[in-house]
Interface confidence: low
């Protein structure tokens, strides 16, 4: 249904508190290093000119896409070419190439401080003096940093932290209540930033096809009652609402996604026995809660997958027909029947089955040529299989720290020109994979960890693309989207790769080490490890260990000492004496 | 996007005869074997009968076996059941579905059997 006004529509469907903080998200994710004063000032602008429209749809600009008025105002900013350079030259194209040319300079890893949680009793009263603001700059300070996230989903932890403020604020111990919500807060965010990152890029590197199949996938294990019909006008409705996220149309996004929430409590009977406590919660929380709904149970006696898909006489002529469906058809009968598969495993026995029936239904006996093609799964099935028993038996082994250790010298030596903050960010959210997945029984152990595998290695992805420095991560990351992890899996040792020289700079410490969190020590000691792996891509581990447990004993020595930088300086060099001569350096 | 409407419910005494239609859209009908499946009031989905592609070859769970009979026009895109002989516990929403599935459909069509 076409509207005279989009933005006017979009304000009403969306009420102003949401459509205000949607355009702060979009401007935001466009223009990351802006302030937060030009973001809220151009944000107040755009929703005075859609009250005009509201009030009246054929005032003056009020027919304007909203790429032409939101990229119009984008293009205001005086010193756009000053802070972005190339980015400024977007602003001379025509929409819908202006648009795209902002998203194409959409930065994964921008150049921005840290953030510093201040003490408890300044936020509390920042928050207390003007919550609005508290609020806005929340959403603006993640945004910028997380140019990809799903926008309506961060207003659902825009409420949360609303909530913990307004809740804590007035405890009795205000840091114990406040504080471990903040931490749960900040990890489901970092989480939830990179799904929708791999979301985005499966949709503009690999196409709709390619996320449509993985959407047919999950649903269908989600849903395994629901009808294909079902799953596929799902999948559709899906797809819309993160094509409009992910190309940063944020308002439709959130009024889709809205839209597709109420259909599926509409319809739940026909979905899902488990949506229920989801859709008696408000919009937000609803969404959420449908996006993580557990599995629903499988139908009972289900037929074999053989007869429809190996046995009927009708294979052929149902795949000549319509490949897209037929292929759907088999991915959601495989799905709902596997839950205990990953989905990039499932979308690698579609691909298995498309490749025979191209082969087989070309051939003079396509039935005889296609009619073992369920054999060719099993080695698919056990080689993830294979690989997550033997990692769970080494996280158990390790712990935690020790297993993101391993994963570090390991990924090091497969991708040493990877850059050492990126090859440490990586490793260590593989290594959460252990305590994220090892624990589930069998029947969970491979959705939750391949998939998760699949998530993080789309960080390293993007990372690595914004400044290419490996043609074997390139090969990994662009060739197949659903053989990422068994590509980066196969990589062996790079014997290419000429070692880094040795900086004694690299090694040096200080006192300032003692006064960090367990977890920036700990990235500390892992900088230092990978550093070492590039300077000796052939140590072997229990070179590394034994380095690695004389650094410890350094830091720790260190830290009790009174004067700690003396010791620190003194120390050091005698320890990177010894780590030389140990690795023969 | 797949569409499936059933329709040709409705209230009938038991010995009577009901013939429910589904109107299939959004994919190449006549390249899919297609199913009818039922839900009883607080039962789960119970598979009805099935039909392949061409029309030939047609099944039927045991329950309705002799009463029931499957049927369908490719050219006009559209599945039918012909149900004889309907008893009280044929009483159901009646879907039809893709494939041989026993999972149901979206709207469904009701058929009551009472007297």
């Known amino acids: 249904d076409a509207h005279k006004s989009e933005v006017a529509h979009r304000f009403k469907d969306l009420g102003e508190e949401n459509f205000k903080a949607l355009v702060l998200i979009a401007f935001a994710q466009y223009l990351q290093q802006c302030p937060f004063e030009d973001h809220v000032k151009l944000v107040n602008e755009v929703t005075e000119f859609a009250k005009t429209c509201v009030a009246d749809e054929s005032a003056e600009n009020c027919d304007k896409s909203l790429h032409t008025l939101f990229g119009d105002k984008l293009c205001t900013v005086a010193t756009l070419r000053e802070t972005y350079g190339e980015m400024a030259d977007c602003c001379a194209k025509q929409e819908p190439e202006r648009n795209e040319c902002f998203l194409q300079h959409k930065d994964d890893n921008p150049n921005l401080p840290r953030l510093v949680r201040p003490e408890v009793d300044v936020m509390c009263t920042a928050f207390h003096d003007n919550e609005e603001t508290f609020l806005k700059k929340y959403l603006y300070e993640i945004a910028r940093r997380h140019p990809y996230f799903y926008a309506p989903e961060l207003l659902f932890f825009a409420k949360r932290y609303k909530a913990a403020f307004t809740e804590c604020c007035q405890a009795a111990d205000k840091a114990a209540c406040l504080l471990p919500k903040l931490d749960e807060l900040r990890d489901e965010g970092k989480a939830s930033s990179a799904k929708q990152r791999l979301k985005c890029a499966s949709l503009q590197k690999f196409g709709e096809r390619a996320f449509k199949a993985w959407a047919v996938a999950r649903l269908s294990q989600r849903f395994p009652k629901a009808e294909f019909a079902e799953v596929s006008k799902l999948v559709t409705d899906l797809t819309k609402v993160h094509t409009e996220c992910c190309h940063g149309d944020l308002l439709e996004c959130a009024d889709d996604r809205a839209d597709l929430a109420k259909y599926i409590c509409e319809n739940q009977d026909s979905i899902s026995s488990k949506l229920k406590e989801c859709c008696e919660k408000p919009l937000l929380e609803k969404s959420h809660c449908i996006a993580e709904v557990e599995n629903d149970e499988m139908p009972a006696d289900l037929p074999s997958l053989a007869a429809d898909f190996v046995e009927s006489k009708d294979v052929c002529k149902n795949y000549a027909e319509a490949k897209d469906v037929f292929l759907g058809m088999f991915l959601y009968e495989y799905a709902r029947r596997h839950p205990d598969y990953s989905v990039v495993l499932l979308l690698r026995l579609a691909k298995t089955y498309e490749t025979t029936l191209e082969k087989c239904c070309a051939a003079a006996d396509p039935h005889e040529c296609y009619a073992k093609v369920f054999d060719e799964f099993k080695p698919l099935v056990e080689e993830p299989q294979n690989l997550i028993k033997q990692n769970c038996e080494l996280f158990e082994q390790l712990g935690e720290y020790k297993f993101q250790n391993a994963l570090l010298v390991r990924y090091t030596k497969k991708v040493p020109q990877v850059s050492t903050p990126t090859l440490v960010e990586v490793s260590r959210n593989l290594g959460k994979v252990g305590s994220k997945c090892c624990k589930h029984p069998e029947a969970k152990r491979m959705p939750c960890a391949e998939d998760y595998l699949s998530v993080v290695l789309n960080q390293l992805c993007v990372l690595h693309e914004k400044t290419p420095v490996s043609d074997r991560v390139t090969k990994c990351c662009t060739e197949s989207l659903v053989n990422r992890r068994p590509c980066f899996s196969a990589l062996e040792v790079d014997e290419t790769y000429v070692p880094k020289e040795f900086n004694a700079e690299t090694f040096t410490f200080h006192a300032d080490i003692c006064t960090l969190s367990e977890k920036e020590r700990q990235i500390k000691k892992q900088t230092a490890l990978v550093e070492l792996v590039k300077h000796k891509p052939k140590a072997t581990k229990e070179q590394l260990k034994a380095v690695m447990d004389d650094f410890a004993a350094f830091v720790e020595k260190c830290c009790k000492a009174d004067d700690k930088e003396t010791c620190f300086a003194e120390e050091g060099k005698k320890l990177v004496a010894a780590s030389q001569a140990a690795l023969g350096l | 996007e797949v569409q499936l409407v059933e329709s040709g419910g409705g209230l009938v005494q038991p010995g009577g005869s009901l013939r429910l239609s589904c109107a299939a859209s959004g994919f190449t009908f006549g390249s899919f074997g297609m199913s009818w499946v039922r839900q009883a009031p607080g039962k789960g989905p119970e598979w009805v009968s099935a039909?392949?592609?061409?029309?030939?070859?047609?099944r039927y769970a045991e329950s309705v076996k002799g009463r029931f009979t499957i049927s369908r026009d490719n050219a006009k895109k559209t599945l039918y059941l012909q149900m004889n002989s309907l008893k009280p516990e044929d009483t159901a929403v009646y879907y039809c579905?893709?494939?041989?599935?026993?999972?149901?459909g979206s709207q469904g069509t009701q058929v009551t059997v009472s007297s």
């Open positions: 039909i392949d592609s061409g029309g030939a070859d047609t």
């Open positions: 579905t893709i494939g041989r599935s026993a999972s149901r």
